[in-house]
Amino acid sequence: SEVEYRAEVGQNAYLPCFYTPAAPGNLVPVCWGKGACPVFECGNVVLRTDERDVNYWTSRYWLNGDFRKGDVSLTIENVTLADSGIYCCRIQIPGIMNDEKFNLKLVIKPAKVTPAPTRQRDFTAAFPRMLTTRGHGPAETQTLGSLPDINLTQISTLANELRDSRLANDLRDSGATIRIG
């Protein structure tokens, strides 16, 4: 079952996905695609990273976090109802069938007619430096093995009512999180 995330038309949608690099610079390729994760790769790729950089992206899709430290959460800019659906975050761990696949369901709600302050704000505007930490959860080993030890955490909703920017680090445990050891 997919984890569900919500956004309003015209907002930026946020789909969290994380991993912890085994060592600084030891990055793992990641792809984001529209539609559930297939057996291999991502279907309808909207963004891709390699061992070094973001090497492919399409309009409105970008990484606001620091992908070099494992924050590969996807931001979709100025969403419309057509952006609703399943998105796949695939962490392409070396080795046969080692990839970790996360299906995240994005539900787009119509914008409120009356322009009024809303508590469900664009996270980027509210916390422009959030989600740049190296992660929470156990991780000890320093090299990629052929069968990595992986911890998964999936929490059903992203906190919508952040009262304090210090809670931003807690969001690191929301969504899809793995460690690579």
Partner: antibody, heavy 125, light 108 residues
Framework: EVQLQQSGPVLVKPGASVKMSCKVS????????MNWVKQSHGKSLEWIGV????????TYNQKFKGKATLTVDKSSSTAYMELSSLTSEDSAVYYC??????????????????WGQGTSVTVSS | EIVLTQSPATLSVTPGDSVSLSCRAS??????LHWYQQKSHDSPRLLIK???QSISGIPSRFSGSGSGTDFTLSINSVETEDFGIYFC??????????FGGGTKLEIK
């Protein structure tokens, strides 16, 4: 204010080892990578390696592999560097330096925004 | 390995002069170039990051420019406290960093 407090100067004999520390304060230790940099007397700076304090993952400059070992103690927010099989070539000032926050997806690397005061190592018989 | 070459090695100036320090990379490093100042017996201090981005607390007389392989640190109207050694550092090959050899700024 962010501070990186390094251990004091040391005088050691050739062949010995030395372990120096870098204790941080006023920021979350596990949220920033920690670099170590060597400065030989009157010379430029050499990057030794970087450690992720969160999981202990280390990446070294090839030149310092086998010479330097980087570790951390999360409970005390302290980074350590041990230098082994010391020779006169290892006489230098060693700095710990924090990786700055990321700047944006179009940039690959980081600057070093806070530095320790340095630990002077003298190797002499 | 990306090699950074700084020039001149030494620059003798009078307070009030405006100066430019050069840092040249052996290959294109985009904007991943940072400048540091080191005064005698002190630690390096970050002056400019990503070629031209200013740092909080650093006087506005320091500015940086350049992209690709050629970079410049400019000091508008040098003050006595500015004398010391200036290093450039590239982070394009992150996490493998390299530094330039330094430019010594001294009083004429």
């Amino acid at each position: 204010e962010v501070q990186l407090q390094q251990s004091g100067p040391v005088l050691v004999k050739p062949g010995a080892s030395v372990k120096m520390s870098c204790k941080v304060s006023e920021y979350t230790f596990t949220d920033y990578y920690m670099n170590w940099v060597k400065q030989s007397h009157g010379k430029s700076l050499e990057w030794i390696g970087v450690i992720n304090p969160y999981n202990g993952g280390v990446t070294y400059n090839q030149k310092f592999k086998g010479k330097a070992t980087l570790t951390v103690d999360k409970s005390s927010s302290t980074a350590y560097m041990e230098l082994s099989s010391l020779t006169s070539e290892d006489s230098a000032v060693y700095y710990c330096a924090r990786d700055a926050d990321f700047h944006g997806n179009s940039y690959v690397g980081y600057a070093m925004d806070y530095w320790g005061q340095g630990t002077s190592v003298t190797v002499s018989s | 390995e990306i090699v950074l070459t700084q020039s001149p090695a030494t620059l003798s100036v009078t307070p009030g002069d405006s100066v430019s320090l050069s840092c040249r990379a052996s290959q294109s490093i985009s904007n991943d170039l940072h400048w540091y100042q080191q005064k005698s017996h002190d630690s390096p201090r970050l002056l400019i990051k990503y070629a031209s981005q200013s740092i909080s607390g650093i006087p506005s007389r320091f500015s940086g420019s350049g992209s690709g392989t050629d970079f410049t640190l400019s000091i508008n109207s040098v003050e006595t406290e500015d004398f010391g050694i200036y290093f450039c550092q590239q982070s394009h090959s992150w996490p493998q960093y390299t530094f330039g050899g330094g430019t010594k700024l001294e009083i004429k």
